[in-house]
Amino acid sequence: QEDEDGDYEELVLALRSEEDGLAEAPEHGTTATFHRCAKDPWRLPGTYVVVLKEETHLSQSERTARRLQAQAARRGYLTKILHVFHGLLPGFLVKMSGDLLELALKLPHVDYIEEDSSVFAQSIPWNLERITPPRYRADEYQPPDGGSLVEVYLLDTSIQSDHREIEGRVMVTDFENVPEEDGTRFHRQASKCDSHGTHLAGVVSGRDAGVAKGASMRSLRVLNCQGKGTVSGTLIGLEFIRKSQLVQPVGPLVVLLPLAGGYSRVLNAACQRLARAGVVLVTAAGNFRDDACLYSPASAPEVITVGATNAQDQPVTLGTLGTNFGRCVDLFAPGEDIIGASSDCSTCFVSQSGTSQAAAHVAGIAAMMLSAEPELTLAELRQRLIHFSAKDVINEAWFPEDQRVLTPNLVAALPPSTHGAGWQLFCRTVWSAHSGPTRMATAVARCAPDEELLSCSSFSRSGKRRGERMEAQGGKLVCRAHNAFGGEGVYAIARCCLLPQANCSVHTAPPAEASMGTRVHCHQQGHVLTGCSSHWEVEDLGTHKPPVLRPRGQPNQCVGHREASIHASCCHAPGLECKVKEHGIPAPQEQVTVACEEGWTLTGCSALPGTSHVLGAYAVDNTCVVRSRDVSTTGSTSEGAVTAVAICCRSRHLAQASQELQ
């Protein structure tokens, strides 16, 4: 998941030269930016989150807020500071006229300002059948560990915490930050106010219809009786959780955010901070039948974003809309006709549908996994959720054609045993945002902080691309793909793996002078090849066919087109071994695949040759997929021949460590 989406409206107001009597001027050359929701009806003008630079102290935040009030008063404007943020993000929430934005953007320490906007609940007993491994019967669903060591925070509506299904499992905190209900004739009916939250609490930890029957929950009210909240209210809720965590550190925390609003830089930033403080956040992908990257918190890379499927593992349709999709979704989970506690009475059940219900399932699974292995990091948990998911069961035809390749075909499932997965080398595929069509456009895919980038590939629907390369950025490797002239844009695809004690580096060979092609290998002692990338400056790589990698030949070598620079990802980690596996098809074919066998994990996926009719290569679970242009356009010449090259790795060290534990 990335947050580089073009649809997000950003207004940049340049700082003027005169300082308007400020004691402290902003650093030279910096420009604070203004952001607002791209979905007009969801905007809440008049309330703004002023986000200050990362190192800003609480006292400076308060001083900046007071300065804004004083300067606004001099101009005859009333302002009201509604909240001063600290603990998660520095900043403050202010009620003021939009006329003051230019003034506010010039204040010292200001990083950016975001106009407040609305967030919404995302809801409109096969569910336990789907997430339960076959050896359990759903009618006697007794999970191996009920999540008893984990606390799940639910940010939602009010809830009926004494419902028979959840009594004693949910502690209602005194946190409440909700907007007024719309409409003068709105009648608050308690059971309706509690409906969404009660149902989700039941899905997570209900006695009879819950996923993690042992999990305890804490609820924060951020959605009103109509299921509507605000970005600012959600931020203050997340801050409340962080402060609670600091005051009284407990075991693992899962935060369930069964809500969605338009893309929000500040909400995504708050989620990132909380995730980096060791909290697992799970959110609804959204019910808009749209790209989840256009919504928050769904688009936050650190959050586990969940789409909804039905009993037949098909994407859920909700009226004219349905589940969101795309690269910002991590996985899907049951989200149609989910039975759960109903606030209509203390013993009632009801079925509800939506990505909220799907997210609640994953929060429950996460609670159980963390209860079994409390030391799991967010990256480890995400990788396990992906690893244990049902693969390739979703009918992708439901998704728009351009989103199919980007959307994970994964439906969440409980691991057959919550222990003993430690030996596995876990990897996942991360797609970048689309680069856009300009000649020099690039796209960047990043791994999570505690994942290793083991390989990098690229993909373009038009086939016009200039390959990809791994490069250092902020002390970490990233995967950058390059668009070509006349191309409609590219994607970068990172293969992100959990490899403890790894030491990885990239070795590059410039384009070869000779006609035999470019080669590069891992020359350091103990380093093995985990991935190959190639990047070229020319607009069109000709039909030159380089020699193809051979498993028995040079296992630590990447081979590519003579006009391309070749990049080898070389890693040293205890017990790491890798091998190259190829599948070449002499006749032209739109798709060539090669898979790693049982016990091995795909770390690298590339195509040979790198000629222009190859659209690109990407990993889907443990299979390397190489896509080429439509056969009818390439003809059936030898240029159509394509080889998919997979690099498959395993860790003997992890396997031994796991055997010693058992």
């Epitope: 009594e167 004693g168 502690m171 006695r207 009879d208 029957k213 013993t347």
Partner: antibody, heavy 115, light 109 residues
Framework: QVQLVQSGAEVKKPGASVKVSCKAS????????ISWVRQAPGQGLEWMGW????????NYAQKLQGRGTMTTDPSTSTAYMELRSLRSDDTAVYYC????????WGQGTTVTVSS | QSALTQPASVSGSPGQSITISCTGT?????????VSWYQQHPGKAPKLMIY???NRPSGVSNRFSGSKSGNTASLTISGLQAEDEADYYC?????????FGGGTKLTVL
């Protein structure tokens, strides 16, 4: 610690009403309702119903047939069970217990219906 | 709601194990994960011994265990002790209410 303290014994005539109270302490009231259970002399336990501290909602056993009313007063952390049109077979020990899970019980209130 | 069926009495010698059964239907015991067991000594309030079929509240001896198969739940007491002599009641959710068993008198010989 979690405690439920009930009102004292009552002796009533047939046709009269009785109101038994149950004061809760030591836990978050709104996380649990109160169940009422009775036990006639030498007999087993009989669930009478449940009442919510959160919103005052009730769930009565069919057998009460409209003779019983359960209420709560969150300001005093007290639940009440009123039984009207008492008959001799209503003679029993009346217990309040925490929630549907009935994990904590009051000491019991003996109600004797005798002419 | 008809009561769940329990044996009227069971007995055992100190140190032995005994099992008390509780039979219902798919609408109560068989349909829910929420079967509880209570111990009641004469003149005292009932005490929760097992909840949600298998779980023991803190402070309850691990000699007490619960299980369920189909429409029948069971309470097993191992290593019988004199203080275990009491009445035992099972309880289950039904769709809208709660139902108790008729009770079982346990005698420690």
């Amino acid at each position: 610690q979690v405690q439920l303290v009930q009102s004292g014994a009552e002796v009533k005539k047939p046709g009269a009403s009785v109101k038994v109270s149950c004061k809760a302490s030591g836990y978050t009231l709104t996380s649990y309702g109160i169940s009422w259970v009775r036990q006639a002399p030498g007999q087993g336990l009989e669930w009478m119903g449940w009442v919510s501290f959160y919103n005052g909602n009730t769930n009565y056993a069919q057998k009460l047939q409209g003779r019983g009313t359960m209420t709560t007063d969150p300001s005093t952390s007290t639940a009440y069970m009123e039984l009207r049109s008492l008959r001799s077979d209503d003679t029993a020990v009346y217990y309040c217990a925490r929630g549907y899970g009935m994990d904590v019980w009051g000491q019991g209130t003996t109600v004797t219906v005798s002419s | 709601q008809s009561a769940l069926t329990q044996p009227a009495s069971v007995s055992g010698s100190p140190g032995q194990s005994i099992t008390i059964s509780c039979t219902g239907t798919s609408s109560d015991v068989g349909g829910y994960n929420s079967v509880s067991w209570y111990q009641q000594h004469p003149g005292k309030a009932p005490k929760l011994m097992i909840y949600e079929v298998t779980n023991r509240p803190s402070g309850v001896s691990n000699r007490f265990s619960g299980s369920k198969s189909g429409n029948t739940a069971s309470l097993t007491i191992s290593g019988l002790q004199a203080e275990d002599e009491a009445d035992y009641y099972c309880n289950s959710y039904t769709s809208t209410s709660m139902v108790f068993g008729g009770g079982t008198k346990l005698t420690v010989l």
